[in-house]
Amino acid sequence: TQHGIRLPLRSGLGGAPLGLRLPRETDEEPEEPGRRGSFVEMVDNLRGKSGQGYYVEMTVGSPPQTLNILVDTGSSNFAVGAAPHPFLHRYYQRQLSSTYRDLRKGVYVPYTQGKWEGELGTDLVSIPHGPNVTVRANIAAITESDKFFINGSNWEGILGLAYAEIARPDDSLEPFFDSLVKQTHVPNLFSLQLCGAGFPLNQSEVLASVGGSMIIGGIDHSLYTGSLWYTPIRREWYYEVIIVRVEINGQDLKMDCKEYNYDKSIVDSGTTNLRLPKKVFEAAVKSIKAASSTEKFPDGFWLGEQLVCWQAGTTPWNIFPVISLYLMGEVTNQSFRITILPQQYLRPVEDVATSQDDCYKFAISQSSTGTVMGAVIMEGFYVVFDRARKRIGFAVSACHVHDEFRTAAVEGPFVTLDMEDCGYNIPQTDESTLMT
């Protein structure tokens, strides 16, 4: 995945007060023991800082060393800082762990911008605000890096939650979640609620706040409203899905649906933006510009470079359109749509104007590696990564930021024909997916 574009990722805390939750629809799926219900100990276990990532607390080694680890569904390595670095407050000290085992193998992960490299080993790992289990997992001890760690982000490593196919150095290195499921009774499923603040947070606010929840092994009803709608995981490498239609304020972009998935579409908590293939991005921006034409914004804003600032509390949300992505459903010829608001795709940025201004970056950007449904999308929804049933579920997040006029939505079913034709078949090569 493109590190230079993927990270830093944004988070944000808070969102709509509970009193603004939508009424729950009643057509729920039947309960599945051990997989749905209440996971109180895991709720609110994520924190983060705007633009710099959602992280969970983990412990590594014996005695346990506590580290904050970025939650990343767009990669498959568990990698932690293991040497001093100017941006790290702490790091994994293998020599202090009696349970560390060296695999005597190196790993090198280059990105478009930056890289990390390290030494492979295994150790005992647990998640304090997760399931009450300890697993022996592969760990990449990062000894050298460039443009990977982020100053002030407060995380010291990355938890790649995708599949073994994209693990480095190769697919024989078992990812953390696979190890967890194999070694324990934790069901093969996790769910994420990323809560965007809708306003920038300073460092002290972030450290004192909640950024969302990673529910390991289940689904928590309190984190979403309405129904969960599922889309198939097309292939188990990234969390690849198929988009069948895109609308801006209800207006179809009318593109060949293959364009939406060229060369893939993935759900990636380690990416800040909604990233779209070049042709799709250009069409979407043209449509968003037309919808918001009562104002004109500079080209640099649409490129994600310039920030537009409004007087605090006067952001004209109403002039910006909603964006709907239709995803392939579980039933033949059936799709559903997820709809995000400008509150998701305009990203609040701190420290640039006065405290009397609210400044935002446009958080939709161009991609050469397909569609990436990053935090911009995920902050609107509770997202269930149901690996056991090879599907991803979406429901409206109980913490998404909205206003009194519009809310994010997950709606269906819609009749959509020939959805299989929307997938793009990538020619098989030996090239690194990380370098594309």
Partner: antibody, heavy 120, light 108 residues
Framework: QLQLQESGPGLVKPSETLSLTCTVS??????????WSWIRQPPGKGLEWIGS???????YYNPSLKSRVTISVDTSKNQFSLKLSSVTAADTAVYYC????????????WGRGTLVTVSS | EIVLTQSPATLSLSPGERATLSCRAS??????LAWYQQKPGQAPRLLIY???NRATGIPARFSGSGSGTDFTLTISSLEPEDFAVYYC??????????FGGGTKVEIK
């Protein structure tokens, strides 16, 4: 070619409202995708942005002045105006109107400016 | 808030000499920076936009460079009409709003 010209009283009493108009000639406000701005410069000091307006009427104001500033546009007269209420001696300055051009990022065309003195 | 600091406050030079003016931003403004010239009793005039592009009608002796936080306006050989006050302005935060405090280029 496009030209901007400020007009309005050169003397305003304290606590009153300063009113200035900028007339655009050589082109139409309503046809062009520019923002139109007011900037001031106290005697011997630097430049201070007051605010900007688009042809649709959408305004942006300097946070330090926003409670006292109103900028409006009259496309039929090809003019935009500034009102600054409750003025004090600190509002004495040369007031410029300007066009935001070059990708709507910079002030590429300016009026000649008009000195407004606040004094009783 | 992004603050633009210009230095020196005053630059005393003779005609024909090279003038180097600095503008430093408190945080990155990418290349969204302009330079203006203001002569006594006149309105400012746009010289350079996007850090290094000369505005229409500006002589080639004026050049701009830099990106991020450090920017330079260079006048390769001062002409008598170049003695004036020069301001920088950023627009990474939009609409454009923030000016530097100015550098006065005076005859030595």
């Amino acid at each position: 070619q496009l030209q901007l010209q400020e007009s309005g009283p050169g003397l305003v009493k304290p606590s009153e409202t300063l009113s200035l108009t900028c007339t655009v000639s050589g082109g139409s406000i309503s046809w062009s995708s520019y923002y139109w701005s007011w900037i001031r410069q106290p005697p011997g000091k630097g430049l201070e942005w007051i605010g900007s307006i688009y042809r649709s009427g959408r305004t942006y104001y300097n946070p330090s002045l926003k409670s006292r500033v109103t900028i409006s546009v009259d496309t039929s007269k090809n003019q935009f105006s500034l009102k600054l209420s409750s003025v004090t001696a600190a509002d004495t300055a040369v007031y410029y109107c300007a066009r935001v051009g070059h990708g709507i990022n910079y002030f590429d065309l300016w009026g000649r400016g008009t000195l407004v003195t606040v004094s009783s | 808030e992004i603050v633009l600091t210009q230095s020196p406050a005053t630059l005393s030079l003779s005609p024909g000499e090279r003038a180097t003016l600095s503008c430093r931003a408190s945080q990155s403004v990418s290349s969204y920076l302009a330079w203006y010239q203001q002569k006594p009793g006149q309105a400012p005039r746009l010289l350079i936009y996007d850090a290094s592009n000369r505005a229409t009608g500006i002589p080639a002796r004026f050049s701009g460079s830099g990106s991020g936080t450090d920017f330079t306006l260079t006048i390769s050989s001062l002409e008598p009409e170049d003695f004036a006050v020069y301001y920088c302005q950023q627009s990474i935060t939009w609409p454009p709003r923030t000016f530097g405090g100015g550098t006065k280029v005076e005859i030595k």
